[in-house]
């Protein structure tokens, strides 16, 4: 009787896993083996697939075989008995377009109110992704072990820290990998559980903001509890996208060491040209806070997001603010290449009652004004990227007097 | 394979000063931080400070800051510890470390045996 | 500085049982500390860090758990190669302090 060739062939690859999985086309004979053969672009010859040679199930791996991913590859199965069945060609294909990212392996640490998740391939080495290493994302899902209800979190790298968390409170999380240039999304890690400790006796400092004054940045922070000393740190935040070293050499800031105030003053040119992550901690001498939230910090954006130039053109009940670039030391004007949104507030001159309007135009009318009558007027600028959420300080207030009635055309 | 080689073990004479080595292979120390750990005879480990040899920053126990001094050079994969003003309370053995992912002093040499000693 | 605490200098057990290994820590460290085993003569070597995960090639009857204050090394059926001393260690904040570590000794 002729052996009939298998069919249906399938290739799983996962990272660096290439599995073959096919059907028995006759169920009623036994004992057949299988074999594969495989064809590289450009070549006549087939080659006999290591690993998969003479199988009894209908399941076989040839991971061990080293291709190079980008190139494509033809396999071909047949049946053998006594003979041999004719040869099933499957379609041709490129393994690192058919591969998929396996489940990242995940490391979690607790602490009260935050949980720190370490995130690194699920192959370590993979040649598979040797040239995407550093180009993989990850989203998670968190949940309170107790309700179930999901969070997602997209766009994180090999280190994340999860704040606002209730102490002694167990949560799960679910992790995914993605590489976006290559339109690739992984399956989900296994469900890692963290349990947070108990509250701290010592909460993290919070509200962290930089400004510049003069040739310095001032670093400040909101405490709870007077007579403290704190320390800040400085990360460079590209070293969070590091795969494959979960050590973080976070670095002191030697003006920023045991102070007893609740900001700090420091040199510009401490930082050069980056971006970089900040966190402060808290001691009273016995005992130490967990690190505050980690705020990024862009020198660029820092040091050239100043407070905006505004003209005011009074009407009788408006005003009309056009606002300009602002000025550096020298009466240049700065160029600013990324999005702003303003903040505008104005204030009747005899009492203290603030108003706010927050654009995007840098032509703004303040509307509902009396006649006759002084307001001042400050602004300032954010930036609108999310991650950044930068605000430059306000400018000095201008203060005008709208013109009498029937002017507003 | 990863390997921390220390220098041999020193007799020295009270107030004099030492200085022990730590040669490692298997990785580049810049990227780590190299530890020193000091053992007195049946008692417990206590960490003298550390090094970040990729910009040289240290940081000191408070006890060991004077005593101590922690240095690198990644020319040759190799970090340092100079001992000062030895006392008898300065004999021990002491060990270099690795400070790997997660913090944990994850390879550790093989340690050097200081006898101070008049 | 945050002390460590190992209350038992000295823990006996025989091969093949279960024992726990106990460790206060002054103040609430996270879950940030690492158990190290120092055989008779040998350089300390790693076994648990961030409190739960064992290092690699550190046989699964190790295991780690704790969180905040309290931590436990337990070794589930006790091998004779398991006698030597145990520290634990905090590297929630500097200085990393270490245990006044725990003997084993195997009946």
């Known amino acids: 009787k002729n052996l009939k060739s298998p069919q249906k062939v399938e290739v799983d690859i996962i990272d660096d896993n290439f599995i073959l999985r096919w059907n028995r086309s006759d169920e009623s004979v036994g004992n057949v083996t299988f074999s594969f053969d495989y064809q590289k672009t450009g070549m006549d010859n087939w080659i006999k697939l290591s690993g998969c040679q003479n199988i009894t199930s209908t399941k076989c791996n040839f991971s061990s075989l080293k291709l190079n991913v980008y190139e494509e590859i033809k396999l071909r199965i047949r049946a053998e008995k006594e003979n041999t069945s004719s040869w099933y060609e499957v379609d041709s294909f490129t393994p690192f377009r058919k591969a998929q990212i396996g489940p990242p392996e995940v490391h979690l640490e607790a602490e009260d109110k935050a949980i720190v998740i370490h995130i690194s391939p699920g192959t370590k080495d993979s040649v598979m992704w040797a040239l995407d290493g550093l180009s993989f994302t990850y989203s998670l899902v968190i949940w309170k072990n107790s309700s179930g209800v999901e969070e997602r979190i997209e766009n994180i790298y090999s280190r994340h820290k999860i704040y606002k968390l209730s102490p002694e409170t167990t949560y799960c999380l679910k992790v995914k990998a993605a590489l976006l240039t290559s339109w690739k999304i992984g399956v989900y890690s296994p469900v890692h559980c963290i349990k947070t400790t108990v509250e701290n006796e010592l909460p993290p400092p919070e509200n962290i903001e930089v400004s510049v004054q003069n040739q310095n940045y001032v670093l400040k922070w909101d405490y709870t509890y007077a007579n403290m000393t704190f320390q800040v740190q400085w990360l460079h935040a590209f070293l969070k996208r590091n795969p494959g070293n979960h050590l973080y050499k976070w670095k002191q800031i030697p003006d920023c060491e045991n102070v007893k105030t609740t900001q700090c003053v420091f040199p510009q040119n401490v930082f050069q040209k980056g971006i970089y992550l900040l966190r402060v901690q808290a001691s009273d001498g016995n005992n130490t806070s967990f690190w505050s939230e980690e705020i990024k910090f862009d020198t660029e954006i820092q040091a050239f997001l100043l407070p905006p130039v505004f003209n005011i053109r009074s009407l009788s009940d408006s005003f009309h603010i056009y606002i300009g670039a602002p000025k550096q030391s020298g009466n240049t004007p700065v160029i600013q290449d990324y999005p702003l949104i303003y903040e505008i507030i104005f204030w009747e001159n005899t009492s203290n009652a603030e108003r706010k309007i927050i654009e995007k135009k840098t032509d703004v009318t303040v509307p509902n004004l009396k006649p006759l009558t002084v307001y001042c007027v400050k602004a300032r600028a954010h930036t609108m990227d999310e991650k950044l959420n930068k605000s430059s300080v306000f400018s000095d207030a201008v203060c005008e007097k709208t013109k009498p009635g029937n002017t507003s055309k | 394979e990863v390997q921390l080689q220390q220098s041999g073990a020193e007799v020295v004479k009270p107030g004099a000063s030492v200085k022990l080595s730590c040669t490692a292979s298997?990785?580049?120390?810049?990227?780590?931080?190299m530890h020193w750990v000091k053992q007195r005879t049946e008692q417990g480990l206590e960490c003298i400070g550390r090094?970040?040899?990729?910009?040289?920053?240290?940081k000191y126990v408070p006890k060991f800051q004077g005593k101590a001094t922690i240095t690198a050079e990644t020319s040759s994969n190799t970090a340092y510890l100079q001992l000062s003003s030895l006392t008898a309370e300065d004999t021990a053995v002491y060990y270099c470390?690795?400070?790997?992912?997660?913090?944990?002093?994850?390879?550790w040499g093989q340690g050097t045996s200081v006898t101070v000693s008049s | 500085d945050v002390v460590m605490t190992q209350s038992r200098k000295f823990m006996s057990t025989s091969v093949g049982d279960r024992v726990s290994v106990t460790c206060k820590a002054s103040q609430n460290v996270g879950t940030s500390v690492a158990w190290y085993q120092q055989k008779l003569g040998q350089s300390p070597k790693a076994l648990i860090y961030s409190a739960s995960y064992r290092y690699s090639g550190v046989p699964d009857r190790f295991t780690g758990s704790g969180s905040g204050t309290d931590f436990t090394l337990t070794i589930s059926n006790v091998q004779s190669e398991d006698l030597a001393e145990y520290f634990c260690q905090q590297d929630n904040s500097y200085p990393h302090t270490f245990g006044g570590g725990t003997k084993l000794e195997i009946k």
């Open positions: 090094i970040d040899p990729e910009d040289g920053e240290t």
């Open positions: 470390s690795r400070g790997g992912s997660y913090y944990v002093m994850d390879y």
């Open positions: 298997g990785f580049n120390i810049k990227d780590y931080y």
